[in-house]
Amino acid sequence: SGTTNTVAAYNLTWKSTNFKTILEWEPKPVNQVYTVQISTKSGDWKSKCFYTTDTECDLTDEIVKDVKQTYLARVFSYPAGNVESTGSAGEPLYENSPEFTPYLETNLGQPTIQSFEQVGTKVNVTVEDERTLVRRNNTFLSLRDVFGKDLIYTLYYWKSSSSGKKTAKTNTNEFLIDVDKGENYCFSVQAVIPSRTVNRKSTDSPVECMGQEKGEFREI
């Protein structure tokens, strides 16, 4: 139950990539406003996005405090201009979100190939170690800093002149692959967390090809 002029939020959905985490919900408010609360299973509720007419709330600052915790959020509905009003049960109407564990569920953002360098018949491909909003000791941690060896990268590479793809994997952000002399190759990488049950893979990075500016060629 609730007041006659408010409706409960619904379709509460977590949208999270590389720990940038936003809670979204419906409906667009008509004569009502929302406040969001978030907590861990064992923690106290903390209010965010007070009396907003938005249907989203950025909860990144809260979840990055401990990305391995499981979080629950709830969205309260209040009549516009009368936020003290409560439902018949003595509290405002609210709806709970699904549980969310950032470490296990945040989407892996599209990776970027930082550089590639050819030395003879070997090419070293380096994946950019993207910065996250997770902080430790006042510094922002990279994706590798957070996930450690849980994160691997898969490299797809192929001759520019053909479509047959080869793959390599690495537990670091670097690959060292064998190539045919005199051939140009194209590369794309994907981030993967093999131990996950959901959101295991990122989208593929933009394709980078030899003979373009990003790489460096050295014949030895």
Epitope: R136, L141, S142, R144, D145, V146, F147, G148, K149, Y153, L155, A168, K169, T170, N171, T172, E174, F175, L176, I177, D178, S195
Partner: antibody, heavy 125, light 108 residues
Framework: QVQLQESGPGLVKPSQTLSLTCTVS?????????WSWIRQHPGKGLEWIGE???????RYNPSLKSRVTISVDTSKNQFSLKLSSVTAADTAVYYC??????????????????WGKGTTVTVSS | EIVLTQSPGTLSLSPGERATLSCRAS???????LAWYQQKPGQAPRLLIY???SRATGIPDRFSGSGSGTDFTLTISRLEPEDFAVYYC?????????FGGGTKVEIK
């Protein structure tokens, strides 16, 4: 050349917390390697306890996870193991080790290539 | 948990002989994640082989590794006196990392 040295009490009472420290010399603990703890029960095989990255990212053996904490102190070039609620079954030689990346098949994978000498911990009243 | 079973438990051989040690995994292990270690009494283990077949720095070429999937082998082509020790296989692909129970290579 990197060297590792375990230190800590050799005798711990049942139900107490075992605390060991591994000091890294000849290299930086922040240089992109992982740091592990492994133990070996008397006359038995090896058991991996867990690992840590300089950033604090950890992975633990699920069989010990509820009792284990591994932490890192980059300013002292050390990492530590705490094992709570110990019993006689935790009596073992405890090793610290470095996990360094090795090239294989187009990528790099981590292996425990440098080990400390080990320290014997006995749990007894 | 991936269980690694090593056989035989003990191998009694003479110097100069060939030693073949087996490691069988309870489920498939990528070669990228398989290692072999040597341990002598009172010492820490020493990395011999990584990636199932690549020798670690300073390891003599009489040591070789092979295999894929669930079956891996460490071969010592000609045993030297210093090779008598316990050998462990290890997988580092799935948490918890696990070791085999070990094969003791002893002097016959």
């Amino acid at each position: 050349q990197v060297q590792l040295q375990e230190s800590g009490p050799g005798l711990v009472k049942p139900s107490q917390t075992l605390s060991l420290t591994c000091t890294v010399s000849g290299g930086s603990i922040s240089s992109g390697q992982y740091w592990s703890w492994i133990r070996q029960h008397p006359g038995k095989g090896l058991e991996w306890i867990g690992e840590i990255y300089y950033s604090g990212s950890t992975r633990y053996n699920p069989s010990l996870k509820s009792r284990v904490t591994i932490s890192v102190d980059t300013s002292k070039n050390q990492f530590s193991l705490k094992l709570s609620s110990v019993t006689a079954a935790d009596t073992a030689v405890y090793y610290c080790a470095r996990d360094a990346p090795y090239y294989y098949g187009g990528g790099y994978y981590y292996y425990m290539d440098v080990w400390g000498k080990g320290t014997t911990v006995t749990v007894s009243s | 948990e991936i269980v690694l079973t090593q056989s035989p438990g003990t191998l009694s051989l003479s110097p100069g002989e060939r030693a073949t040690l087996s490691c069988r995994a309870s489920q498939s292990v990528s070669s990228s994640y398989l290692a072999w270690y040597q341990q002598k009494p009172g010492q820490a283990p020493r990395l011999l082989i990584y990636g199932a077949s690549s020798r670690a720095t300073g390891i003599p070429d009489r040591f070789s590794g092979s295999g894929s999937g669930t079956d891996f082998t460490l071969t010592i082509s000609r045993l030297e006196p210093e090779d008598f020790a316990v050998y462990y296989c290890q997988q580092v692909g799935v948490v918890p990392y696990t070791f085999g129970g070990g094969t003791k290579v002893e002097i016959k």
